[in-house]
């Protein structure tokens, strides 16, 4: 299953499959997730080691048993790949690292006014993988405000050095934020020239394209079909690059297919997995296990659950079957692709779904790095769980926020439905940033069921929580994915990095905002909160947040939206925006429904018809 815990001051011994330099443990974990054989990783921060060559070292590891012995190493961080972790799987990495220079091939230098502008330039350059920016206080005046765009053979820095007044980061192309745009078309009977960066076997051109999209240096590809004239080259997928970023030439060639990486697509990237099953096809590879199962779909599920399995073949040969069950061959290879593809066999083959974003319903998100009063504009994909609850009567308007917590579930405040309990009038918009982008053609979700907490009473502050079941499940993308729920009765965690988001008023007597706002607000103890609200009962099922001096808060229109806190690299839904005295007033914190106190209720109500929870808190 999905293991998200990190081990501090621990290093896994042995099992090395690759090593590289990464700026932090989260990026190292992401590289492990996308490496075909990596199950475990260990990372050495600069502070953990004197050896300059090993500083920022990221060590990717495999193990037949799924684990390795841990040795104590001060400062080291170790953990697991996020394969099988559903919507937590993302190649998107937004963080900017201060005081760090990520080295690589510098291919473009320009003057810019901020590190954000430098990151944007990198994201909008087809070859840029990462960048470094010299701030205005950099010691050499001639380098100040320099933005260096970089690449490397593996997509990670060739070295990382601690350097004052330098800030570094990665391209946001994997976040689907590139302005370049992409070529969706595939060209039949056409071969591209230029440099081959890798060669894999794939059953069709679409799998070849997805592999190209997630390969650090692939910009375009040529696929040789299963009827290509040279037998040894059939089903070969050549991943390619060029100096210019586009093919320098193309040749008409029967039974070849060419196309482009989709990494530069805006707003939508293909999933990093291949879910299609290929009947009549055998995938060859190293044998991991053989098991008898009933049906090819069960074979695929078995492969997906066995974390080291990369692909499978389900044999329908009479000698491989007994009763209704047949042999399911679970296989792997060095590069994650079959070592042989054979057609016209009595088998069906496919890939593990361990890297599918939509994966398992029962895990929670770690990713992403009332208007809000005193807030700032959010950016695309920053809060992908935030939804807008809108009512359409004669006109349509935003009324409340909400949080996506599963494919078909939104968590919000019960008071949003005061006087509007009819599910037909509601429209739920997800994956949006600007309310002005909503037109009559913008897709929205309709409500199948509104579940208001049984103890909620109108105009009382208690039990202000409601679940919305959507009529149809939503697919997860970089801009639309769920927030992790806290553990039941979570009281031990001390949250220091909490944010409230919403489109609500920017002042008490204001109006709904166009761009989703965010504000960083500290949590306040319930004792402190009770002192500020002597006319109300602040219960253990509430959580408060706000600045003593006021100025930053949720406000009308933010209700039902999330109060999220980041802990150990993972965002959790700590509160639901509920009530407060005015907005952002001095010594009047906002009051939020404490989600951890309602975990039993949430899990009970979200049981699917087969009795399996649709979402779950971290173990």
């Amino acid at each position: 299953g999905c293991l998200t815990q990190l081990y501090e001051n621990a290093f896994f011994r042995g099992g090395d499959v690759a090593s590289m330099y990464t700026p932090n443990a989260q990026y190292c974990q992401m590289r492990c997730t996308f490496h075909p054989r990596c199950l475990l990783f260990s990372f050495l921060p600069a502070s953990s080691i004197n050896d300059m060559e090993k500083r920022f070292g990221c060590f990717l590891k495999d193990s037949v048993t799924g684990t390795l012995p841990k040795v104590h190493r001060t400062g080291a961080v170790s953990g697991h790949s996020l394969k099988q972790c559903g919507h937590q799987i993302s190649a998107c990495h937004r963080d900017i690292y201060k005081g760090v220079d990520m080295r690589g091939v510098n291919f473009n230098v320009s003057k810019v006014s901020s590190v954000e502008e430098c990151q944007k330039r990198c994201t909008s350059n087809i070859r840029c993988q990462f960048f470094s920016y010299a701030t205005q206080t950099f010691h050499k005046a001639e380098y100040r405000n320099n933005c260096l765009l970089k690449y490397s053979p593996g997509g990670t820095p060739t070295a990382i050095k601690v350097l004052s007044n330098v800030e570094s980061g990665f391209s946001l192309k994997p976040c689907a934020l590139s302005e370049i745009g992409c070529h969706m078309n595939i060209f039949q009977h056409l071969a591209f020239s230029d440099v081959d960066v890798a060669r894999v076997l794939t059953p069709d051109a679409f799998v070849c394209r997805t592999i190209c999209t997630y390969h650090p240096n692939c910009l375009f590809f040529t696929f040789y079909t299963n009827v290509w004239k040279i037998e040894s080259q059939r089903n070969v997928c050549l991943l390619k690059t060029s100096e210019s970023g586009t093919p320098s030439s193309s040749t008409p060639q029967e039974n070849t297919i060419s196309g482009y990486s989709l990494l530069t697509c805006k707003r939508t990237l293909p999933e990093p997995c291949h879910s299609k099953i290929y009947p009549g096809v055998d995938f060859g590879g190293e044998e991991l296990n053989v098991t008898f199962v009933k049906g090819v779909n069960v074979c695929q599920e078995t492969c997906t659950k066995m974390i080291r399995c990369q692909f499978f073949t389900y044999s329908l040969l009479p000698e491989d079957c007994k009763e209704e069950k047949c042999k399911c061959f679970l296989r792997l290879s060095m590069d994650g692709s079959p070592t042989r593809i054979a057609y016209g066999t009595q088998g069906s083959s496919g890939y593990s779904l361990r890297l599918c974003n939509t994966g398992d319903n029962s895990v929670c998100t770690t990713k992403t790095s009332t208007r809000i009063v005193g807030g700032t504009n959010s950016s695309w994909g920053e809060w992908p769980w935030q939804v807008s609850l809108q009512v359409k009567l004669t006109a349509q308007r935003h009324l409340c926020g909400g949080s996506l917590i599963g494919h078909q579930w939104v968590l919000t405040a019960a008071h949003c439905f005061d006087g509007l309990p009819l599910q037909d009038v509601w429209r739920i918009y997800s994956g949006i940033l600007n309310l002005s982008d909503i037109t009559k053609d913008t897709p929205f979700s309709q409500i199948k069921e509104i579940i208001i907490h049984q103890n909620y009473k109108v105009s009382e502050g208690n039990h202000d929580i409601a679940l919305i079941k959507l009529q149809a499940p939503l697919n997860y993308t970089e801009f639309q994915k769920p927030i992790c729920l806290p553990s039941k009765g979570d009281t031990s965690t001390i949250y220091t990095n909490c944010w409230v988001t919403g489109w609500g008023f920017s002042k008490e007597k204001g109006e709904i905002q166009n761009i989703l706002q965010k504000v960083n607000i500290p949590l306040v103890t319930n004792e402190e909160c009770q002192k500020r609200y002597q006319d109300y009962k602040i219960t253990q099922r509430m959580v408060c947040a706000g600045y003593k001096e006021g100025g930053k808060d949720a406000c009308k229109g933010d209700s039902g939206g999330p109060l999220v806190c980041k802990h150990n690299g993972m965002w959790r839904l700590v509160g639901i925006t509920s009530w407060g005295e005015g907005c952002a007033r001095r010594e009047q914190p906002g009051v939020y429904t404490k989600v951890a106190e309602y975990m039993d209720w949430i899990l009970e109500k979200t049981q699917s018809s087969d009795g399996k929870a649709q979402m779950q808190s971290p173990a």
Epitope: D204, T225, P279
Partner: antibody, heavy 119, light 107 residues
Framework: EVQLLESGGGLVQPGGSLRLSCAAS????????MMWVRQAPGKGLEWVSS????????SYADSVKGRFTISRDNSKNTLYLQMNSLRAEDTAVYYC????????????WGQGTLVTVSS | DIQMTQSPSSLSASVRDRVTITCRTS??????LNWYYQAPGRAPKLLIF???SLHRGVSSRFSGSGDGTEFTLTISSLQPEDIGTYFC?????????FGQGTKVEIK
Amino acid sequence: EVQLLESGGGLVQPGGSLRLSCAASGFTFSQYLMMWVRQAPGKGLEWVSSIYPSGGYTSYADSVKGRFTISRDNSKNTLYLQMNSLRAEDTAVYYCARVSTAVADNDYWGQGTLVTVSS
Amino acid sequence: DIQMTQSPSSLSASVRDRVTITCRTSQNINTYLNWYYQAPGRAPKLLIFGVSSLHRGVSSRFSGSGDGTEFTLTISSLQPEDIGTYFCQQSYSSPWTFGQGTKVEIK
């Protein structure tokens, strides 16, 4: 030029049999997955059966399973569909189609042959 | 089996009009979506494969788009020779299934 030419259609009584043929030219027939698709009068398209190049793997729609048999003779560049126990609902134009597995489509189709099952 | 729902079932448009046909699938089919054109009394012909890629010889006035479960075929400028029936097909999961068709006529 890729060409597919069906033959063997006609009028047959319910319970009767018919064998359709599809002669292929203009490509290396022995390398391609082939399929039969049918279209009832005034209706949409329905996949009937598929066969891999070697003939080692065949599959059928539930509606024809156990009654129809797909086969091929790569030396004659010909695809066949043996239809037994025919029913009125099998009345349709039958098309043979080549499959491009590299992009998963039916890139070339024959002109079709009409099968009428009626008493 | 994956269900394919095409809309509209028929449409009438003028020459040079922009025409859009929609195809919805009962589950995510990734990019395994093809479009075919069938002239009256003729065999189907492949227009677009993999959602948006034109088959060789097909006019660039045809284009395809979409993702996951919702797809569209667009004819940017309808021509008299475009009359006939258009079918979508999913090739993601066996059995491959077709939409019920959209009949296009000239006003």
